[in-house]
Amino acid sequence: IPLTESYCGPCPKNWICYKNNCYQFFNESKNWYESQASCMSQNASLLKVYSKEDQDLLKLVKSYHWMGLVHIPTNGSWQWEDGSILSPNLLTIIEMQKGDCALYASSFKGYIENCSIPNTYICMQRTV
Amino acid sequence: IPLTESYCGPCPKNWICYKNNCYQFFNESKNWYESQASCMSQNASLLKVYSKEDQDLLKLVKSYHWMGLVHIPTNGSWQWEDGSILSPNLLTIIEMQKGDCALYASSFKGYIENCSIPNTYICMQRTV
């Protein structure tokens, strides 16, 4: 293959591969906990936003989807499933109503939502 | 790698790979002809929509982007850059205004537009 071309992955079959990360958008609406369980069952996690450059495909994503960001009531912080803290200036997250989970929307926006509300979701698997 | 996982591609570096097709979304606004030339310079063509199943990632694309669909005034048909005719029931084409080129919008919609209007665009490369 030409030097300018390369393979991406490995990823689960029929997932999107971009800059060696794997993504899948799931159409069925589930609450946050069910969405998390669905991703975990596929050796993945809910979407983690860690880089505007490496994840610029997310700019153009339509609609709202659960991502792996949750509120930790004990200290009031927001963190990803892996325990890492939300980095500043990565996402513009708005709390329009009470909630402890977050939806991803286009242009690196997030909406805080009640975790028990069903929504579509994005799973992500980082390749090594 | 696990049997359930696979590599995707090959694709140009940092393009999106999905079901062995390569896609790239370009931010800069160009007219249709410039967009076509840009894709060709990267050994690709403007987006061709050929399958709702194989290209279901396009459902979630936000905004409007040039694709490779053009009007042939001599016979009144719409065809892709490669000369193939637009298959029925693939795209819902909406004639917002007079034009011979088409923009792709989410949920498999196409908007007819004047070819000289600048817009963002999607390049696509089909892997063998």
């Epitope: 009031g76 912080s77 927001w78 939300l86 500043p88 200036n89 513009t92 997250i93 708005i94 709390e95 329009m96 109503q97 009470k98 929307a105 286009s106 242009s107 690196f108 926006k109 805080i112 | -």
Partner: antibody
Framework: EVQLVQSGAEVKEPGESLKISCKNS????????VGWVRQMPGKGLEWMGI????????RYSPSFQGQVTISADKSINTAYLQWSSLKASDTAMYYC????????????????WGQGTLVTVSS | EIVLTQSPATLSLSPGERATLSCRAS??????LAWYQQKPGQAPRLLIY???NRATGIPARFSGSGSGTDFTLTISSLEPEDFAVYYC?????????FGQGTKVEIK
Amino acid sequence: EVQLVQSGAEVKEPGESLKISCKNSGYSFTNYWVGWVRQMPGKGLEWMGIIYPGDSDTRYSPSFQGQVTISADKSINTAYLQWSSLKASDTAMYYCGRLTMFRGIIIGYFDYWGQGTLVTVSS
Amino acid sequence: EIVLTQSPATLSLSPGERATLSCRASQSVSSYLAWYQQKPGQAPRLLIYDASNRATGIPARFSGSGSGTDFTLTISSLEPEDFAVYYCQQRSNWPWTFGQGTKVEIK
């Protein structure tokens, strides 16, 4: 220094259209949401809606949905509020404001306000 | 939508006195409530957010308390510049809403 500067007072007749502006400076316009609040003469405050200038995502309060249009031009750090056909009942002071950021999250309070634009609709 | 009811409508006090303003929500808003001050001819100013946090630059004589449906703004010792209209606002549910205001006037 964060500043929101609104366009000047307007006197219009019923049925006319109008677009008022809110120029933002001193912060990253696309990292926050901006909103509009109405205050009718001698009355309290009412939320109209909010906009994210990064991609013009907009949320309207149900009572203002379809009555006004909120927009933004991120290239000039300006938010707008417009009417296609004014009514006498649109007579009010209109304030724009920037939503607060707390622990990295945008929350629904204005920490900075414009000076207000008085709109008078009368025949 | 959530209705906020402020009381009293008017509070007549002298400088140096303690002012206690009340805001009651039609349903629980948790601690998602703010207080603003508005003087004639001016835009409102954020005083307290999320029930008890003082906004930047707000003097310590202003304090907020409460959660659920009942909230209080207290001004421990009124200064001449504190005579104004005070509004509460909830952000617990969209659309966000304001109370109708309490006017604190000089007795």
